[in-house]
């Protein structure tokens, strides 16, 4: 076809951004291109062309009219992880092509099993008590908080400090006795540890 004066090659005007998304949730990788004639858009993951509903109507990925890639649900198994990876969109017309910046799609996860469950502690009143916990593996890395008798502990109380996976209670009182649970949390949700009992005895 002859070059028309007003025609111009593609350029990406909206690049996709890195995203972390939970398994089973929908998400979109944005891409917008300008050019004349209007460029066609294709997506590539880790260098391999991504199939969309344009190739297979049953696909869980849809190429939107804007050029964005919409995932009906993020698919992510124990082994197969077809949606996780590094994506680029490529815009093409007869004058050339433009490639977007890379965008990583990572799948958030939060396992069930705690790396370390807290264990029962027995202390004398007035002594410090330390309960330790390591949350389940997760992405993003889970943060933790603690519950005593199913109620979240306020770590603003001056006798209580939470650092990393350690709950430290200085100058313990009888009222501190009870069942303590460590809670690991990230964008996927929350996981409760096995409970640990703190026993405080009078000397």
């Amino acid at each position: 076809s002859r070059l028309r004066q007003e025609d111009f090659p593609p350029r990406i005007v909206e690049h996709p951004s890195d995203v972390i998304v939970s398994k089973g949730e929908p998400t979109t990788l944005n891409c917008k291109a300008e050019g004349r004639p209007t460029p066609t858009i294709e997506w590539y993951k880790d260098g391999e062309r991504v199939e969309t509903d344009k190739d297979d109507p049953r696909s869980h990925r849809m190429l939107l009219p804007s050029g964005s890639l919409f995932f009906l649900r993020i698919v992510h198994g124990r082994r197969s992880k077809p949606d996780e990876g590094s994506y680029v969109c490529v815009a093409r017309n007869y004058l050339g092509e433009a490639v977007s910046r890379n965008a990583s799609l990572e799948v958030a996860l939060l396992r069930d099993d705690f790396r370390q469950n807290p264990t029962d502690v027995v202390v004398a009143a007035g002594e410090p008590a330390i309960l330790e916990c390591q949350p389940p593996r997760g992405h993003p890395e889970p943060t933790i908080y603690w519950k005593k008798d199913k109620v979240r502990i306020d770590d603003k109380e001056e006798r209580i400090s939470i650092r990393g996976g350690k709950l430290m209670i200085s100058n313990t009182r009888k009222s501190d006795a009870g069942m303590y649970t460590c809670v690991g949390t990230n964008m996927v949700g929350e996981r409760d540890s096995d409970p640990a009992e703190l026993t405080v005895f009078e000397r």
Partner: antibody
């Protein structure tokens, strides 16, 4: 269309090796683990192992370790299963199967009959 | 290895019957269980994944249930095309059960 197309039937002598191919199309080859499953005549399904096409990592059950090799060529989206030191009880239909993101074998090849006979 | 035990190994039933096949794991596999149907000379076909999720395109008369160690595949009203062999598979270690052949009574 998502499909797996396997190589044709083979007849081998005991002690020989066989290499079966599995050509994938219609999906992102490196995104899904590929498994091999075999079925002896009149018997059930026996899992032989997997390959991760993204990096070539493999895993096999104890029974097949040292005798099976799984490889892939990402440029032609094809997985291979090589079974060595063939015995008569290796006579079976060999299937490749894609593992979905739901941890199940959702797409299967048509099967390759391997006959081991002297 | 986690061993999968299917029962019965075969059964005879009539069109319209409700059919139940069970699968037991030697240790807990949570909901990591799949069911397949295989007809003579054909590759297996996925029916149910994750113990109870129906694979796209599979008729709703097929259903799966269970978690932990005990699982069930149910065909609510057996159709002529359902006479086949059924296999369970655990997707932790990927081993299959021994199969259940559903024959015409």
């Amino acid at each position: 269309e998502v499909q797996l197309v396997q190589s044709g039937a083979e007849v081998k002598k005991p002690g020989a090796s066989v290499k079966v191919s599995c050509k994938a199309s219609g999906y992102t080859f490196t995104g899904y683990y590929m498994h091999w499953v075999r079925q002896a005549p009149g018997q059930g399904l026996e899992w032989m192992g997997w390959i991760n096409p993204k990096n070539g990592d493999t895993e096999f059950p104890q029974k097949f370790q040292g005798r099976v090799t799984m490889t892939r060529d990402t440029s032609i989206t094809t997985a291979y299963m090589d079974l060595s030191r063939l015995r008569s009880d290796d006579t079976a239909v060999y299937y490749c199967a894609r593992e979905s993101g739901d941890d199940a074998f959702d797409i299967w090849g048509q099967g390759t009959m391997v006959t081991v006979s002297s | 290895d986690i061993v999968m035990t299917q029962s019965p190994s075969s059964l005879s039933a009539s069109v319209g019957d409700r059919v139940t096949i069970t699968c037991r794991a030697s240790q807990s596999i949570s909901s990591y269980l799949n069911w397949y149907q295989q007809k003579p000379g054909k590759a297996p076909k996925l029916l149910i994944y994750a113990a109870s999720s129906l694979q796209s395109g599979v008729p709703s008369r097929f259903s799966g249930s269970g978690s932990g160690t005990d699982f069930t595949l149910t065909i609510s009203s057996l159709q002529p095309e359902d006479f086949a062999t059924y296999y369970c598979q655990q997707s932790v270690g990927l081993f299959f059960g021994g199969g259940t052949k559903v024959e015409i009574k």
